[in-house]
Interface confidence: low
Amino acid sequence: CKAMHVAQPAVVLASSRGIASFVCEYASPGKATEVRVTVLRQADSQVTEVCAATYMMGNELTFLDDSICTGTSSGNQVNLTIQGLRAMDTGLYICKVELMYPPPYYLGIGNGTQIYVIDPEPCPDSDF
């Protein structure tokens, strides 16, 4: 397993609708044709997998249908969007990139993006 550098922004603020987007960029040492991107959430020293997708270079990024993540790829950049976030989801979101194919296998883990989520106050005229 060979190491690879992965860059991602330090801080992102989720929108009032609970959507956060950030770019995960990796320094590809070779011509990868199959790439796997995993988003991990670290909070209170616990690490959990948020979502993952395998994609072929030049093809769209396909998460599972029930995933809270969507994304697009362009070259060595992956534009990730996480939806449905609430205040309790605030935490460090780490981008993990694996160059699966062809060998050699490369693994890169970013330093993480701190996503802050603030639950919106209900509007006075709403039905809440």
Partner: antibody, heavy 123, light 107 residues
């Protein structure tokens, strides 16, 4: 010991949908890196790769046939199903399912094959 | 799609002959090439993967070489059970593509 076996109709009519099942043993499609592919061979002709499904539910299709193909898996029953819509006489072929070789991490060679099933498309 | 060509399309040989089959890719596929053997009415059998790696259980008289666009399958001493059709397959880029095959028959 890895084994695969294809099953399905031997004769389909033009415009119908062909559904083939690959039943396998000796491996699990929930194991990271595992995949099952479908390849066909028209009488007296070369091999043509059709589709592949990964352990993680991701699918890949031959671009020329993508609009007609659907590949699914049932991990608990150890089977993979290929559906091919709008069959035509030119689709007459022997259809094979095969296990993706994972000796090299993430590879795309097929190291175990089923015996194949001959499908004839005719009215 | 990457086009795969093989030569010769057929070869007549005798037992204990050295047989060489070549495969050419229309673009660079690194070493992501496999060789399969197929006998009539049977499924293909993987012989060589990653251009030169011998699949488990395959006799050592089979060997593969090459990188980039040009590849070779060699049978060092042909045995009666080797009379079959041989196909190459590229696995560098989707869609995977196979060569048209080389038939090895008895002289």
């Amino acid at each position: 010991q890895i084994t695969l076996k294809e099953s399905g109709p031997t004769l389909v009519k033009p415009t119908q949908t062909l559904t083939l099942t690959c039943t396998f043993s000796g491996f699990s499609l929930s194991t990271s890196g595992v995949g099952v592919g479908w390849i066909r061979q028209s009488p007296g002709r070369a091999l043509e790769w059709l589709a592949l499904i990964y352990w993680n539910d991701h699918e890949r299709y031959s671009p020329s046939l993508k609009s007609r193909l659907t590949i699914t898996k049932d991990t608990s029953k150890n089977l993979v199903v290929l559906a091919m819509a709008n069959m035509d006489p030119v689709d007459t072929a022997t259809y094979f399912c095969a296990h993706r070789n994972i000796e090299y991490r993430r590879s795309y060679f097929f190291d175990y094959w089923g015996q194949g099933t001959l499908v004839t498309v005719s009215s | 799609d990457i086009q795969m060509t093989q030569s010769p399309s057929s070869v007549s040989a005798s037992v204990r002959d050295r047989v060489t089959v070549t495969c050419r890719a229309s673009q660079d596929i690194n070493n992501w090439l496999a060789w399969y053997q197929q006998k009539p009415g049977k499924a293909p059998k993987l012989l060589i993967y990653a251009a030169s790696s011998l699949q488990s259980g395959v006799p050592s008289r089979f060997s593969g070489s090459g990188s980039g666009t040009d590849f070779t399958l060699t049978i060092s001493s042909l045995q009666p059970e080797d009379f079959a059709t041989y196909y190459c397959q590229q696995a560098n880029t989707f869609p995977f593509t196979f060569g048209p095959g080389t038939k090895v028959d008895i002289k």
